[in-house]
């Protein structure tokens, strides 16, 4: 889980070791702050859970691409 010690900087110290179904992901944000020990992606799920993931993993990149496309596609 993400950890905000000194708000507003949120850092990830551990990554999920499992793929999360892309259909359960609502949004993401990148963590690139130099105050954090590692770069990370924090996914927010449709039930508002936040999960730290490793941006180097393919499923994480695929999920971000999927969410980007979803955001670009206007709802009919």
């Amino acid at each position: 889980q993400p950890d905000a010690i000194n708000a507003p900087v949120t850092c990830c110290y551990n990554f999920t070791n499992r793929k999360i179904s892309v259909q359960r992901l609502a949004s993401y944000r990148r963590i690139t702050s130099s105050k954090c020990p590692k770069e990370a992606v924090i996914f927010k799920t449709i039930v508002a859970k936040e999960i730290c993931a490793d941006p180097k993993q393919k499923w994480v990149q695929d999920s971000m691409d999927h969410l980007d496309k979803q955001t670009q596609t206007p709802k009919t």
């Epitope: 999920t16 499992r18 859970k49 999960i51």
Partner: antibody, heavy 119, light 113 residues
């Protein structure tokens, strides 16, 4: 193509435990979410629990808490469901089921394992 | 927990006639941001595991005949078999996958009249 192959039928006495296995092929277990669903004779489907990557842990239906343990052996891509303190009402077919990365629903099911609890 | 309630419990329909099964969830399973309903339909024949028919409430799984259709949104859903065939005799289940614990409807048995 993903395949789930479960262990064979079991007959157990009340109070005993049973351990059912589910071997995954076509994927590695760590890429999937494994769940267990049971069905008593002539009854409906009942979700027992499974690995929830959103929580990073296995979650269990309240009804089975304390009596069921779901484990995985990632070296053999085999999942296990152990149910203890068996009673006659636990007589059922037990299914393993998984969902893939691009879905959230159960795409694949094992063939089922009949567990009979009888004295 | 989200409670799923199906109606009717059983249904007898003549061959070639329409069969309609309803499923109601106690809470909405629609995620408004992507406008998707996290609801699936399965059919189950005796001695077999459930088979996926429809996901996202209305999308047919590949290989499923087009006589099967799903509709509805939010809390109220319908599975329709437009022209019942002998091989459609089975028990049909709805299931929500919006939030854990995942829950099933109690099932609807479809028979030939």
């Amino acid at each position: 193509q993903v395949q789930l192959v479960q262990s064979g039928a079991e007959v157990k006495k009340p109070g005993a435990s049973v351990k059912v296995s589910c071997k995954v092929s076509g994927y590695t277990l760590t890429e999937l979410s494994m769940h267990w669903v049971r069905q008593a004779p002539g009854k409906g489907l009942e979700w027992m629990g499974g690995f929830d990557p959103e929580d990073g842990e296995t979650i269990y239906a309240q009804k089975f808490q304390g009596r069921v343990t779901m484990t995985e052996d990632t070296s053999t891509d085999t999942a296990y469901m152990e149910l203890s303190s068996l009673r006659s009402e636990d007589t059922a077919v037990y299914y393993c089921a998984i969902h893939e990365f691009w879905s959230g629903y159960f795409d694949y099911w094992g063939q089922g394992t009949l567990v009979t609890v009888s004295s | 927990d989200i409670v799923m309630t199906q109606s009717p419990d059983s249904l007898a329909v003549s061959l070639g006639e329409r069969a309609t099964i309803n499923c109601k969830s106690s809470l909405s399973v629609l995620y408004s941001s992507n406008n998707k309903n996290y609801l699936v339909w399965y059919l189950q024949k005796p001695g077999q595991p459930p088979k996926l028919l429809i996901y996202w409430a209305s999308t047919r799984e590949s290989g499923v005949p087009d006589r099967f259709s799903g509709s509805g949104s939010g809390t109220d859903f319908t599975l329709t078999i437009s022209s019942l065939q002998a091989e459609d005799v089975a028990v049909y289940y709805c299931q929500q996958y919006y939030s854990s614990p995942w829950t099933f409807g109690q099932g609807t048995k479809v028979e030939i009249k």
